[in-house]
C-alpha cells in the first residue's frame, strides 16, 4: 500500500512540476525592468524566452518576438534548449509512469517490468527537473551579471544623438515558477525511484518441489512457482500446474534417479 501511495504521489508531484516547467517556458516574465518614467506614463519591459513585451501604466501592451536565431545570445539559446529538453523528458517520463502505476493493470505485466518502468520514469523526472533548474539558473545568472553594469552613454550619430541606457533588470515571475516546478519534478522523480525499490521482487522464496516422473522420458519444466511480492493474486506459493508434482508438505517422496529438487 505504501509503495502504491509513494508511486502515485510521485506521479502527481511530477505532473504538477512538468506543467509548471511548460508554463514557465511559455511565460513572458523571465526578466522585468522599468524602461523610463515620463511625467505621464510609466513604461515597463518584460522579456521571455520567445518574445519581449512593453507594458504601460495605462494597461497598453505590445509584444514582439525574437524572430532572428543568429542574433540571439548563446546563453538564451542554451536556456531554451534546457527547458525544451526538460519538457520532452518530463513528457516521456509521464507517459512511461502511467503504464508503471501499480493501480493500473495492463494485461499480464509483471511487477518487475513495472518496477523497471517506475525507475525509468523516475530518472527521467530527475533529469527533467535538473534541466529546468539549470535553465532558470543560467538565465538568472545572466540577469545578475547585467545588474552591475548600469551605464548610460550618449554619442552623436547620423542625424542626431544616440542615447544608450543600461537599466537594471530584475527576476521575473517565470524564474520562480521554473525553480519551483523543477524542484517538484525532481522530488517526484526521487519518489518514483523510492517506489521502484518497493515494487521490485527482492527475494524469491521457492518451496522445494520434487517432481515424480510417470515415465522414463519426462522433461523437467522449470518455473512451477512464481515469485510473489504479496501484491499479486498468487499471494501464497500455489501450484501453477500439477503434472506429477507434489510439494514436500503434501507427500513424503523417496529419492530416485527421476527426482529433481
Amino acid at each position: 500500500m505504501a509503495v502504491t501511495a509513494c508511486q502515485g504521489l510521485g506521479f502527481v508531484v511530477s505532473l504538477i512540476g512538468i506543467a509548471g516547467i511548460i508554463a514557465a517556458t511559455c511565460m513572458d516574465q523571465w526578466s522585468t525592468q522599468d524602461l523610463y518614467n515620463n511625467p505621464v506614463t510609466a513604461v515597463f519591459n518584460y522579456q521571455g524566452l520567445w518574445r519581449s513585451c512593453v507594458r504601460e501604466s495605462s494597461g497598453f501592451t505590445e509584444c514582439r518576438g525574437y524572430f532572428t536565431l543568429l542574433g540571439l545570445p548563446a546563453m538564451l539559446q542554451a536556456v531554451r534548449a534546457l527547458m525544451i529538453v526538460g519538457i520532452v523528458l518530463g513528457a516521456i517520463g509521464l507517459l512511461v509512469s502511467i503504464f508503471a502505476l501499480k493501480c493500473i493493470r495492463i494485461g499480464s505485466m509483471e511487477d518487475s517490468a513495472k518496477a523497471n518502468m517506475t525507475l525509468t520514469s523516475g530518472i527521467m523526472f530527475i533529469v527533467s527537473g535538473l534541466c529546468a533548474i539549470a535553465g532558470v539558473s543560467v538565465f538568472a545568472n545572466m540577469l545578475v551579471t547585467n545588474f552591475w553594469m548600469s551605464t548610460a552613454n550618449m554619442y552623436t550619430g547620423m542625424g542626431g544623438m544616440v542615447q544608450t541606457v543600461q537599466t537594471r533588470y530584475t527576476f521575473g515571475a517565470a524564474l520562480f515558477v521554473g525553480w519551483v516546478a523543477g524542484g517538484l519534478t525532481l522530488i517526484g522523480g526521487v519518489m518514483m525511484c523510492i517506489a521502484c525499490r518497493g515494487l521490485a521482487p527482492e527475494e524469491t522464496n521457492y518451496k522445494a518441489v520434487s517432481y515424480h516422473a510417470s515415465g522414463h522420458s519426462v522433461a523437467y519444466k522449470p518455473g512451477g512457482f512464481k515469485a510473489s511480492t504479496g501484491f499479486g493474486s498468487n499471494t501464497k506459493n500455489k501450484k501453477i500446474y500439477d503434472g506429477g508434482a507434489r510439494t514436500e508438505d503434501e507427500v513424503q517422496s523417496y529419492p530416485s534417479k527421476h527426482d529433481y529438487v
Epitope: 519591459n45 497598453f60 545570445p73 540577469l143 551579471t145 544623438m161 544616440v162
Partner: nanobody, 124 residues
C-alpha cells in the same frame, strides 16, 4: 540605426499655431514609440508628448500642453507631427524628437535616438 530630422519650427505670435514634423529613416521597424521633448535656454530638457509607433498609437501629454498640443503619426511616411495651438511665450524652446527602440535584447541596453532639434519661438 534610426535617423531623425525635425522641421517646421519658426517664429509665431502668442495664441498662434504651428506644426512641427519629425521624419524617421533607417531601421524604423524597430521603433516602439516616438516623443517630443523641449529645452528652453537655461532649463532642462522636458517631456512634451509621445505616441506609440505601432498598435493603435496611444498618446500621452505633459500637463502643461494638454488640450493645446496634439501628437500624431503617419507610419507610411515614417513621420511624427506635433500640432501646437494657443501658443504661449513660455512654449519658446528647442523642440527635439526622440525615438525609443523596442527592447529585443535580453538584459541589453535601451536605445533612444534623438534628432538635432527645431527652434520654436513664441513672441508676445
Amino acid at each position: 540605426q534610426v535617423q531623425l530630422v525635425e522641421s517646421g519650427g519658426g517664429l509665431v505670435q502668442a495664441g498662434g499655431s504651428l506644426r512641427v514634423s519629425c521624419a524617421a529613416s533607417g531601421r524604423t521597424s524597430s521603433i516602439y514609440d516616438m516623443a517630443w521633448y523641449r529645452q528652453a535656454p537655461g532649463n532642462e530638457r522636458e517631456f512634451v508628448a509621445r505616441i506609440v509607433w505601432r498598435s493603435g498609437g496611444s498618446t500621452s501629454y505633459a500637463d502643461s500642453v494638454k488640450g493645446r498640443f496634439t501628437i500624431s503619426r503617419n507610419t507610411a511616411k515614417n513621420t511624427v507631427y506635433l500640432q501646437m495651438n494657443s501658443l504661449k511665450p513660455e512654449d519658446t524652446a528647442m523642440y527635439y524628437c526622440r525615438a525609443f527602440e523596442f527592447p529585443l535584447q535580453i538584459g541589453g541596453q535601451n536605445v533612444y535616438y534623438w534628432g538635432q532639434g527645431t527652434q520654436v519661438t513664441v513672441s508676445s
